[in-house]
């Protein structure tokens, strides 16, 4: 059809209209008539591409006629009025309603003028994210799971992480026909360094004003990682008492601490107080290797530390260790 001239009438409508599954939507369509132009509209017609016949007709003398009267309604067209607004309301949107529609004005003397509108049927997805609790497997496993349920079109899921790893995303039909559930797993090799850190799942969808961000705090179960602190290699006779601390990182938390030496039980000057070992002043040099054994639900690990208490007074009075 040739392009309209300067004084021509124009049918105005958006190229695309979004509507939500199960809701109602209005397909807007208006006749724009220049100030000086005379026109008479005798009929409004809506049809769907690929289908014969009209789905909705409003005739100047006969009024409206619908292919599905309970689902369609002219919003503004009324008998006895100028037919300039062909906007059509559709109720109870279904997946199969998505497609191209033509809004047509039969005008005199300008003829038939039409415009095409693409109706997008959307479904807003529900999004959840959850941790996948893992142990030290030594190989890549899912540590977080992000699910966008019942979206149309399918939601787009991405991950943001400083820990490395890679996504594994899959799709499955949603509960409602035509909707899609997207599941994305964040996969990495578990380590104790990952435990307690977070990754973020970002869900994007046409129905969202902005992307939804869901943060997942990761859980990696691992046996204790043990070290002993509190000794600075400068312990001398006749100094104050000192403390050794058994530092343990584990998930779940440690259930018990056990102190011993390589020679067996603790000597009299060493007193265990949970994660700490109290070293009382001694009157003769010692050279003892202490062992701290830490237990949690996944096992036990230990650390060793050799302590020497040397002769020769310190330059300033101080404890055998800073405490």
């Amino acid at each position: 059809w040739p392009p309209p001239g300067t004084g021509d009438i124009i049918v105005q409508a958006p190229t695309q209209v979004p509507g939500f599954l199960g809701d109602s939507v209005t397909l807007p369509c208006y006749l724009q008539v220049p100030g000086m132009e005379e026109t008479h509209v005798s009929q409004l017609t809506w049809s769907r591409h690929g289908e014969s016949g009209s789905m909705a007709v409003f005739h100047q003398t006969q009024g409206p006629n619908y292919s599905e009267p309970k689902r369609l309604e002219f919003v503004a067209a009324r008998l006895g009025t100028e037919l300039r607004d062909a906007s059509l309301r559709m109720f109870g949107l279904r997946v199969e309603d998505e497609g191209n529609y033509t809004c047509l004005f039969v005008t005199f003397p300008q003829g038939s003028r039409s415009v095409d509108i693409w109706l997008r049927v959307l479904a807003k997805p529900q999004n959840t994210a959850e941790v996948q609790k893992v142990q030290l497997t030594g190989k890549p496993v899912p540590v977080a799971r992000c699910v966008s349920t019942g979206g149309r079109p399918p939601a787009h899921i991405t991950w943001h992480s400083d820990l490395g790893g890679m996504p594994n995303t899959s799709q499955a039909p949603g509960f409602l026909s035509g909707t899609v559930t997207v599941t994305s797993l964040w996969i990495l090799v578990p380590s104790s360094q990952v435990d307690g850190k977070s990754v973020t799942c970002k869900v994007e969808h046409e129905s969202f004003e902005k992307p939804q961000l869901l943060t997942v705090n990761l859980t990696v179960y691992y046996p204790p990682e043990v070290s002993i602190s509190g000794y600075d290699n400068n312990w001398y006779l006749s100094q104050n008492e000192a403390t050794l601390t058994c530092d343990a990182r584990s998930n779940p938390e440690p259930t018990g601490y056990n102190w011993s030496t390589t020679m067996g039980p603790l000597p009299p000057f060493a007193v265990a107080q949970g994660a700490q070992l109290l070293i009382r002043p001694v009157d003769k040099p010692i050279n003892t290797t202490f062992i701290c054994n830490v237990t949690n639900a996944l096992g036990a690990r230990q650390a060793e530390l050799t302590v020497q208490v040397k002769e020769g007074p310190p330059s300033e009075p101080s404890g055998m260790s800073s405490n």
Epitope: W1, P2, P3, P4, G5, T6, G7, D8, P34, M36, E37, E38, H40, S42, H59, Q60, T61, G80, V106, F108, P109, Q110, G111, S112, R113
Partner: antibody, heavy 121, light 109 residues
């Protein structure tokens, strides 16, 4: 077939009125647009107005506004054109024409045989 | 007041091609002028040929075609027949009224 049959010739005095009829057959009258056109002796064709038969909606050539009235009678599928305050220069053959649609546009499809109106004192 | 001008008369040989034009006093003819062409043979009623610049009416032979030619509307008759001898009128729309051209008398000789 589609036909428009007009009323017979009229002779009128200046200042009088004339009402010309145009009876349609062979199509759905109420969905049609009908134009009235005239041709004075030795002159060109002149468009007077159109009417949408279904509702009686009209559009008049401003030259004739106030002197001409177009009406329809859907029960008899007849269109009427009344011209008042006749002058001698209204002497002409008056035609009714039904507009038809071709493709996405209208055309002057079928014409009546014409009605001669003579205005003479 | 818009004036629509046509060639008063044209002659074409049988089988020949002829183009009738329609000029507007207000400037170039566009699709918004909804150019119509009607034919009147002697002693017969008018008959619509073309609507909306280039849409041939049902039953009109394909040898008749409408178009825009430069700044004018045009009716081209390709392969003229003796029965095409008639008066041809162009009609243009100007926002709120139709204006007829003076007509072209076409002779097929």
């Amino acid at each position: 077939q589609v036909q428009l049959v007009q009323s017979g010739a009229e002779v009128k005095k200046p200042g009088a009125s004339v009402k010309v009829s145009c009876k349609a057959s062979g199509y759905t009258f109420t969905s049609s647009y009908i134009s009235w056109v005239r041709q004075a002796p030795g002159q060109g064709l002149e468009w007077i107005a159109w009417i949408y038969a279904g509702t009686g909606d009209t559009n008049y050539n401003q030259k004739f506004t106030g002197r001409v009235t177009m009406t329809t009678d859907t029960s008899t599928s007849t269109a009427y054109m009344e011209l008042r305050s006749l002058r001698s220069d209204d002497t002409a053959v008056y035609y009714c024409a039904r507009h038809g649609m071709t493709g996405r546009g209208w055309y002057f499809a079928v014409w009546g045989q014409g009605t001669t109106v003579t205005v003479s004192s | 007041q818009a004036v629509v001008t046509q060639e008063p008369s044209l002659t074409v040989s049988p089988g020949g091609t002829v183009t009738l034009t329609c000029r507007s006093s207000t400037g170039a003819v566009t699709t918004s002028n909804l150019a119509n062409w009607v034919q009147q043979k002697p002693g017969q009623a008018f008959r619509g040929l073309i609507g909306h610049t280039n849409n041939r009416a049902p039953g009109v032979p394909a040898r008749f075609s409408g178009s825009l030619l430069g700044d004018k509307a045009a009716l081209t008759l390709s392969g003229a027949q003796p029965e095409d001898e008639a008066e041809y009128y162009c009609i243009l729309w100007y926002s709120n009224k139709f204006v007829f051209g003076g007509g072209t008398k076409l002779t097929v000789l």
